[in-house]
């Protein structure tokens, strides 16, 4: 660590005095101190002499000697006071710039340590400090305003009591800059815009920041627009607004609009798209298939997407039949707006009943006219089966009728013993009927098919079973011949109860 001679922490001299400060180290040494006149520097290897033969108040300050080659970076310091009765202050800088919440050092150095008791900090023209100004004083360094605020950006003077009167320093301008967290915040309204050619439109681009130094502009398809800026200050933020008013839009006004703001922290931008159309439009679509099949008892939501400009003047869901004249309950229909020009309309159909199959139409109207989108809802049913014994053209025939949706497939089984349902161990014979006769097949209704099994002689200790199945489920009917005639057995429990 270098050593300074004289080896005192502070040295007090009068103006005009000769001052010699000598620094000795192991290697070469360097002096650092306030920029002031009349100093002479003489270096000789490991020592360096700083001297003046005419000290002035401007030489007041802390002089530090460092040894650049020292890996520990040690230093020694001495503070020099040049006590001038006419000049109690040596101001090292007339402008101090800090960020908010930093400590701001106003470097007015006292030239006489004796005056420390009577020092104070004031604003220029003798005005008192702002309330809540928290500061401290060091005769070596000056006044420190702790955690400086933007509002404390003022011109200050250091005051010392000399012979009963206050003597002021020259003024120091403090600039407290707001801490800018990032580029300005932006809003571009609306987020999307559609207009018919000839209509009026407005696009508003606004940016705000804690600091006034930022730029904002609105551009259309990369062309910067000439819009007079409107400025404001509220909620402790500076706001700059650009309003684009188009009295009569045309196709060349369409396209991409970007609101761009920048400051020292960087750039922010946000965009919107402006569509200009020739006339009103109304488009209905659905992500769902317009032909829907649902199992009876289950629920279904029908969804329609509407894209329209101008807005809808009316809309409703209508049941077009064929079963009843009931209409969907309004409480089951709801609308959600995705954005200004796109909406989703949903019709909820919970626990569907047979009478609710059919056509459902969504109708919407705007100045562009009426549009409709129709869904066809068919209900799926598991098969219901019945078997009867009859004679056709003199031959004994088992006749199986199965109805359900989708169209059921029919399989005949012959099994030993009397049973409600043939199991694998009992099965003697199986017949698949690939083409049962379709008895009825109307839209939105069940399909009824009929299958015939010609039996020359009914075996009395056997069971004949008709099984029908489709994608929803299966149904069966067991036919048990008895000597006195024939006996039919429906299954123990029906799979479906309408």
């Amino acid at each position: 660590i270098p050593v300074i001679e004289p080896s005192v922490p502070e040295l007090v001299v009068k103006p005009g005095a000769t001052v010699t400060l000598r620094c000795v180290g192991n290697g070469s040494v360097e002096w650092d101190g306030p920029p002031s006149p009349h100093w002479t520097l003489y270096s000789d290897g490991s020592s360096s002499i700083l001297s003046t033969n005419n000290a002035t108040f401007q030489n007041t300050g802390t002089y530090r000697c460092t040894e650049p080659g020292d890996p520990l970076g040690g230093s020694a310091a001495i503070h020099l006071y040049v006590k001038d009765p006419a000049r109690p202050w040596n101001v090292l800088a007339q402008e101090v710039v800090v960020f908010e919440d930093q400590d701001a050092l106003l470097p007015c150095l006292l030239t006489d340590p004796v005056l420390e008791a009577g020092v104070s900090l004031v604003r220029v023209r003798g005005r008192p400090l702002m309330r809540h100004t928290n500061y401290s004083f060091s005769p070596w360094h000056g006044f420190t305003i702790h955690r400086a605020k933007f509002i404390q950006s003022q011109d200050y003077q250091c005051s010392a009591l000399m012979g009963g009167r206050k003597v002021m320093s020259i003024s120091i301008r403090l600039k407290v800059q707001k801490v800018i967290p990032g580029p300005p915040a932006l809003t571009l309204v609306p987020a999307e815009l559609v207009r018919i050619r000839g209509e009026a439109a407005q696009i508003v681009c606004s940016a705000s920041s804690v600091d006034v130094n930022f730029d904002v502009f609105l551009q259309h398809n990369n062309t910067k627009l000439a819009i007079p800026q409107q400025s404001d200050f509220h909620n402790n933020r500076y706001q700059k607004v650009l309003t684009l008013n188009l009295d009569q839009v045309d196709f060349q006004h369409a396209g991409n609009y970007s609101c761009v703001a920048s400051n020292v922290q960087g750039k922010h931008s946000t965009s919107m798209f402006f569509r200009v159309v020739e006339s009103a439009y109304l488009n209905l679509s659905s992500e769902q298939n317009l032909i829907q099949e649902v199992t009876v008892g289950e629920g279904l939501n029908l969804k329609v997407m509407v894209e329209a400009y101008p807005g809808l003047q009316g809309f409703n869901w209508t049941y077009l039949g064929p079963f009843s004249d009931h209409q969907p309950e309004p409480k089951l229909a709801n609308a959600t707006t995705k954005d200004t020009y796109r909406h989703t309309f949903t019709l909820s159909l919970p626990r569907l009943k047979p009478s609710e199959a059919g056509r459902y139409s969504f109708l919407a109207r705007n100045p562009g006219g009426w549009r409709a989108l129709t869904f066809e809802l068919t209900l799926r049913y598991p098969p219901e089966v019945s078997v009867i014994w009859t004679f056709i053209n003199g031959s004994g025939t088992l006749l199986c009728a199965a109805s359900g949706y989708p169209q059921p497939n029919v399989t005949w089984l012959q099994c030993s013993g009397h049973t409600d349902r043939c199991d694998e161990a009992q099965v003697l014979q199986v017949w698949d009927d690939p083409y049962p006769e379709v008895l009825s097949q109307e839209p939105f209704h069940k399909v009824t098919v009929q299958s015939l099994l010609t039996v020359e002689t009914l075996e009395h200790n056997q069971t004949y079973e008709c099984r029908a199945h489709n994608s929803v489920g299966s149904g069966s009917w067991a036919f048990i011949p008895i000597s006195a005639g024939a006996h039919t057995h429906p299954p123990d429990e029906f799979l479906f109860t309408p």
């Epitope: 259309h220 062309t223 007079p228 409107q230 400025s231 684009l244």
Partner: antibody
Framework: QVQLVQSGAEVKKPGASVKVSCKAS????????MHWVRQAPGQGLEWMGW????????NYAQKFQGRVTMTRDTSISTAYMELSRLRSDDTAVYYC???????????WGQGTTVTVSS | QSVLTQPPSASGTPGQRVTISCSGS????????VNWYQQLPGTAPKLLIY???QRPSGVPDRFSGSKSGTSASLAISGLQSEDEADYYC???????????FGGGTKLTVL
Amino acid sequence: QVQLVQSGAEVKKPGASVKVSCKASGYTFTGYYMHWVRQAPGQGLEWMGWINPNSGGTNYAQKFQGRVTMTRDTSISTAYMELSRLRSDDTAVYYCARLYYYYNMDVWGQGTTVTVSS
Amino acid sequence: QSVLTQPPSASGTPGQRVTISCSGSSSNIGSNTVNWYQQLPGTAPKLLIYSNNQRPSGVPDRFSGSKSGTSASLAISGLQSEDEADYYCAAWDDSLNGPVFGGGTKLTVL
């Protein structure tokens, strides 16, 4: 409809000042920059400067810096152009023009003739 | 001395097509759009073409504009006697933060 109506003709002596007004109607006055352009007899168009009616901010052509002052009164949707220390070569027709967003002057005042003569 | 350069005069007979050129620099025409103004004798200038090639409503489609690099041109087809006027080109100049004009071209219909 959108229009700009300027004050009447002026005759001034060299060294004097002239203040020309331009009243806007049919649109939002603060929504567009107002420019001033002059045309000396038999000469072309010469841009003088613009004013932002919103903020009062201005930008003057180098040639007129120090001699021209552009102001506005938003309460009556009027822009003003004052030219001081008039010389004989300031004799011209002075136009105010609305600057449309795409940097074109889409609406012009009818013009104010200023004659500078001793 | 105008910033944009135009020929001082042009002429044509009725029905003919005439073209007026306008040249500038990178700070004006090179980086911004060009506008054309028509000034009939004793009247204020009127916007004729904006954004290089767009016509305001009411301007006949006989008038068309184009731009390439630092030059632009105005074409008038099917020349009519009422087209006799002064034509000015103009463009925003980034270095001035204001518009610059051409010296004007006097069009005579012979």
